[in-house]
Interface confidence: low
């Protein structure tokens, strides 16, 4: 899920629902597990820069090395630069740490473009803004990477929070977060808030900065407002979900529902874009095409490779449609929708200084291992992975971007039968789960 | 108005290094990326990379990578290009231009600093 | 890498004369063309942006169109000052490359 390689002029939504509308639930979410409410310490400890990638500040070792890692949903290895590379400002020195211990095994990980391999061990690790614990836990040191690294990102690590499925080399090097629930008394669920730049970036410093929080052991209703709802994770590996509808300002894509999750939907902070399969991506595009035909944009906007750009103020957001995934809920037969802007599927370029214009990257892309939810998306929604009762919520975030005229969106319940015909069954093999890569 | 300024002509030995400025004046330095392209005689227009002024991002062509250092120092207004391990095949004169992001045009040039390799 | 190829090398034209070069790009870049005159030992000039907008203060004589792989730099009535070497540059990606050059003598 590395980022470099895979890492309105109408009020509210378009178009009534399609679908019965259930009566709403009297209470408004059911007991979460964890500490509730406020998670000070850990409010606003992720940085990054737009499109590369959001981290946390971890200390590895005795004394304490301080790193700053990627948080990436899509992986589940913790692994840090650990030897000098052009684009590290600095790595995990293991020979000046009196607590590292050598795994004496290896591990490689090729991408579909780039790579990393290592050395596996292990030593204490801690989250200065984070829960006051320090665990052991194991760390791939990365001694050797192609196009893993990303120049001027300010990251030196990944930390990987999905399941022990796809950790490398093989299932059985515990994940961190397994880690800290065990050796800890810290509840088994995180939550992401991710807060997109929100602004052409010629409004502040080019490359602008974005925050967000991570907030382990619980929920912090702070980072939210409205209700949270929840989709089952479907299998433990990635934290995979089911989407069993797609709407484009209100109109059904109409297809399949299996297509939408060919060959699996996962909840992915380290990529940038949200990645559809090929026939749901042409779909996808044709509708927003439509959709926003008062101006015409080069074909390549579309593939993600040239930017559309603006006078300074002007981007015309009202032409653009909101997209809307309906997720599989809870209860029997029903879903619910989360909806998002164009000022989160249009991503301000980061690498571009001009005081002219405001320019924009389409961040929805073609996918051939199934939908990706990026970024793009994860930048409009408070979610929570709870791992303990195995689902995922989603909240409209306190800190997403939106204008005067719409916001993002989490709405249900919707009536929706035969959800389960929507997961695709993947073929077991020896191959299923080589690729972690998303290109 | 408008302009880039390039520092004066070089003549250096093989297996050096030559370090040619650009300065900027009459428009913010930091609205704009700063490419450099280079000439040898008689030759063609080659690019060579990019500096944004803002953040100190690069990005360098595969022939020069590892040679090319392209830095800026924005209290002053100016860009340089360092291109290390000179060859006679580096005698050419180097222009930086500024481009602008909505067409990516190099609207304006330096006027080009000669730099002769020879031993 | 995307290669830039252009066409003729050279020609030869009299004043008053239309003047057209073509530009090909290896693959598609849409509309991402810019066109550059080059007097000798001087810096080169954007003249088109975008395959066909003209540059502010260049003579409305000169004009580009196409898109996808073929473009076309077209100089309607050259005069004395036109005399000179025009480059092709594709702006999409990196590294960003030139054609070759086209250079309009004087027959």
């Known amino acids: 899920t590395h980022l470099g390689i895979r890492l309105p002029l109408r009020s509210g939504l378009a178009g009534p629902p399609l679908g019965l509308r259930l009566p709403r639930e009297t209470d408004e979410e059911s007991e979460e597990p964890g500490r509730r409410g406020s998670f000070v310490e850990m409010v606003d400890n992720l940085r990054g820069k737009s499109g590369q990638g959001y981290y946390v500040e971890m200390t590895v070792g005795s004394p304490p090395q301080t790193l700053n890692i990627l948080v990436d949903t899509g992986s589940s290895n913790f692994a840090v630069g650990a030897a000098p590379h052009p684009f590290l400002h600095r790595y995990y020195q293991r020979q000046l740490s009196s607590t590292y211990r050598d795994l004496r095994k290896g591990v490689y990980v090729p991408y579909t473009q780039g790579k990393w391999e290592g050395e596996l061990g292990t030593d204490l690790v801690s989250i200065p803004h984070g829960p006051n614990v320090t665990v052991r836990a194991n760390i791939a040191a990365i001694t050797e990477s192609d196009k893993f690294f990303i120049n001027g990102s300010n990251w030196e690590g990944i930390l990987g929070l999905a399941y022990a499925e796809i950790a490398r080399p093989d299932d059985s090097l515990e994940p961190f977060f397994d880690s800290l629930v065990k050796q800890t008394h810290i509840p088994n669920i995180f939550s992401l808030q991710l807060c997109g730049a929100g602004f052409p970036l010629n409004q502040t410093e080019a490359l602008a900065s974005v925050g967000g929080s991570m907030i382990i052991g619980g929920i912090d209703h702070s980072l939210y407002t409205g209700r949270l709802w929840y989709t089952p994770i479907r299998r433990e590996w990635y934290y995979e979900v089911i989407i069993v509808r797609v709407e484009i300002n209100g109109q059904d894509l109409k297809m399949d529902c299996k297509e939408y999750n060919y060959d699996k939907s996962i909840v992915d902070s380290g990529t940038t874009n949200l990645r559809l399969p090929k026939k749901v991506f042409e779909a996808a595009v044709k509708s927003i095409k439509a959709a926003s035909s008062t101006e015409k944009f080069p074909d390549g906007f579309w593939l993600g490779e040239q930017l559309v750009c603006w006078q300074a103020g002007t981007t015309p957001w009202n032409i653009f449609p909101v997209i809307s995934l309906y997720l599989m809920g809870e209860v029997t037969n029903q879903s619910f929708r989360i909806t998002i802007l164009p000022q989160q599927y249009l991503r301000p370029v980061e690498d571009v200084a001009t005081s002219q214009d405001d320019c924009y990257k389409f961040a929805v892309s073609q996918s051939s291992t199934g939908t990706v939810m990026g970024a793009v998306i994860m930048e409009g929604f408070y979610v929570v992975f709870d791992r303990a009762r195995k689902r995922i919520g989603f909240a409209v975030s306190a800190c997403h971007v939106h204008d005067e005229f719409r916001t993002a969106a989490v709405e249900g319940p919707f009536v929706t039968a035969d959800m389960e015909d929507c997961g695709y069954n993947i073929p077991q093999t020896d191959e299923s789960t080589l690729m972690t890569g998303r290109a | 108005q408008v302009q880039l300024v390039q520092s004066g002509a070089e003549v250096k030995k093989p297996g050096a290094s030559v370090k040619v400025s650009c300065k900027a004046s009459?428009?913010?330095?930091?609205?704009?990326?700063m490419h450099w392209v280079r000439q040898a005689p008689g030759q063609g227009l080659e690019w060579m990379g990019s500096?944004?002024?803002?953040?100190?991002?690069?990005n360098y062509a595969q022939k020069f990578q590892g040679r090319v250092t392209m830095t800026r120092d924005t209290s002053i207004s100016t860009a340089y290009m360092e291109l290390s391990r000179l060859r006679s095949d580096d005698t050419a004169v180097y222009y930086c231009?500024?481009?602008?992001?909505?067409?990516?045009?190099?609207?304006?040039w330096g006027q080009g600093t000669t730099v002769t390799v020879s031993s | 890498d995307i290669q830039m190829t252009q066409s003729p090398s050279s020609l030869s034209a009299s004043v008053g004369d239309r003047v057209t070069i073509t530009c090909r790009a290896s693959?598609?870049?849409?509309?991402?063309l810019n066109w550059y005159q080059q007097k000798p030992g001087k810096a080169p000039k954007l003249l088109i942006y975008a395959a066909s907008s003209l540059q502010s203060g260049v003579p409305s004589r000169f004009s580009g169109s196409g898109s996808g792989t073929d473009f076309t730099l077209t100089i309607s009535s050259l005069q004395p000052e036109d005399f000179a070497t025009y480059y092709c540059q594709q702006p999409l990606s990196h590294p960003r490359t030139f054609g070759g050059g086209t250079k309009v003598e004087i027959k």
């Open positions: 500096i944004n002024p803002n953040s100190g991002g690069t």
């Open positions: 693959q598609s870049i849409s509309s991402y």
């Open positions: 009459g428009y913010t330095f930091t609205g704009y990326y």
């Open positions: 231009a500024r481009v602008r992001v909505r067409h990516y045009g190099m609207d304006v």
